[in-house]
Amino acid sequence: EEELQVIQPDKSVLVAAGETATLRCTATSLIPVGPIQWFRGAGPGRELIYNQKEGHFPRVTTVSDLTKRNNMDFSIRIGNITPADAGTYYCVKFRKGSPDDVEFKSGAGTELSVRAKPSAPVVSGPAARATPQHTVSFTCESHGFSPRDITLKWFKNGNELSDFQTNVDPVGESVSYSIHSTAKVVLTREDVHSQVICEVAHVTLQGDPLRGTANLSETIRVPPTLEVTQQPVRAENQVNVTCQVRKFYPQRLQLTWLENGNVSRTETASTVTENKDGTYNWMSWLLVNVSAHRDDVKLTCQVEHDGQPAVSKSHDLKVSAHPKEQGSNTAAENTGSNERNIY
């Protein structure tokens, strides 16, 4: 039993960020005379939150009218709570002293915990593109959440990934926390349309997790396959040679025709066809006048894809025999073709 007790009935209070926190406090007596003050923390570094005697505390309101006679309810409300408001709050009765007021009795304290939502997860991939069969790393970051407990999952096209590492910082007590996760993903040729998803679940999200995504189209490079073929003779002295560039991504591609090692023509892929898996096909052809050649001609289709070292495919065009095939349908009819006559 004591002359005056300061009662803080709530050991802890949990409030969502942006809401109002109510911190309850009652005194069992109004004697001795003196103000009630609220502090965050204890000891010499404690922070004054409210002083009944004087001061301006714009975020704080009293639950009851402290100017009312016999009022012993010293509860307060703190508006627009942020994670920085987390801590233990003490309701402290002071008594009039000479010359200064003297701390008389403190409540046991109420721990204010702030529930703050994590920020939208941001997923970032590697700086440079990588080719199928390679393993690439994706990072996911989310910040500003509290409490510390959080769940992070990775998915690729809806399938949960298992090869990832996650850290929540800081390790110790803090007003809010951040999560950082790195996942390893093995690329396949079919990943142009694939998505990597980072999913964050937290108590503040009420079962509706936040997601961050990265499109593998930003990460993957599928190198083309080349096929050079000689079409049936179009006319007595002309041969149509095509270079099929298949299954490449991204579209950025430059093709060069070489005749016996000499540059014949260079063109950039424009009118491409898209495959179901998101890769592209493109075809270029060359019309060769074989009558101008005494010797065999080595035709090379050289492709530089997405700034990578060139790949090439060659075809030996024999000039000694010109079998004539009537009525053949060739790609030379294509309006998008380019003709190159050799004399």
């Epitope: 004591e2 109004l30 004697i31 001795p32 005379v33 005697k53 100017t67 006679r69 016999n70 009039k96």
Partner: antibody, heavy 114, light 111 residues
Framework: QVQLQESGPGLVKPSQTLSLTCTVS????????VNWIRQPPGKGLEWIGI???????DYNSALKSRVTISKDTSKNQVFLKLSSVTAADTAVYYC????????WGQGTTVTVSS | DIVLTQSPASLAVSPGQRATITCRAS??????????MHWYQQKPGQPPKLLIY???NLESGVPARFSGSGSRTDFTLTINPVEANDAANYYC?????????FGGGTKVEIK
């Protein structure tokens, strides 16, 4: 139940120090303050001072230079010392609990005389 | 110091009648919404007994015939109806400012 009992010499010589003890029961001296009040014969009440539960003290400025209030919590006792007494210090001395003064001792009469 | 002046100095009342004692403070005894004024009854050879605290609150065990009112500097103790055993000295006391002070007392006699 709550009780307070004053004790001490009934006669003190002028210029000497008056020493009284208030023995309490039914409450803790760490939880409650104890006041000393005096009442000269046929006159009104005068507050001398208080010792709070935490051991801090507040005194009547008119007596401050001469008065000391202390306590021994383990013995449930509060002490009053008033130095350099004169005949004007002759009075019934009371101890009373806390700022509200809700419980009083019966009082002890102190006469200052040679 | 806050000086408390009680009036009247003495008062004779018949049983069943109302007795009113006033206490005027030289400065306000109000703080934080409350009046730190209390009333005590003292019978001869006895210590004072708390009747009313914080101007208007009846102490536990005290008959409801006693009531207190007032704020800031002017306070009243009312006994209604007066009974024979109410004959005593009555003191007001403030503990809003140091030093705590008592009024000079009012002697109530029963006719």
């Amino acid at each position: 139940q709550v009780q307070l009992q004053e004790s001490g010499p009934g006669l003190v010589k002028p210029s000497q120090t008056l020493s009284l003890t208030c023995t309490v029961s039914g409450f803790s001296l760490t939880g409650y303050g104890v006041n000393w009040i005096r009442q000269p014969p046929g006159k009104g009440l005068e507050w001398i001072g208080i010792i709070w539960g935490d051991g801090s003290t507040d005194y009547n400025s008119a007596l401050k230079s001469r008065v000391t209030i202390s306590k021994d919590t383990s013995k449930n006792q509060v002490f009053l010392k008033l130095s350099s007494v004169t005949a004007a210090d002759t009075a019934v001395y009371y101890c009373a609990r806390a700022g509200k003064m809700d419980y009083w001792g019966q009082g002890t009469t102190v006469t200052v005389s040679s | 110091d806050i000086v408390l002046t009680q009036s009247p100095a003495s008062l004779a009342v018949s049983p069943g009648q109302r007795a009113t004692i006033t206490c005027r403070a030289s400065e306000s005894v109000d703080s934080y919404g409350n009046s730190f004024m209390h009333w005590y009854q003292q019978k001869p050879g006895q210590p004072p007994k708390l009747l009313i605290y914080l101007a208007s609150n009846l102490e536990s065990g005290v008959p409801a015939r006693f009531s207190g009112s007032g704020s800031r500097t002017d306070f009243t103790l009312t006994i209604n109806p007066v009974e024979a055993n109410d004959a005593a000295n009555y003191y007001c006391q403030q503990n809003n400012e140091y030093p705590w002070t008592f009024g000079g007392g009012t002697k109530v006699e029963i006719k």
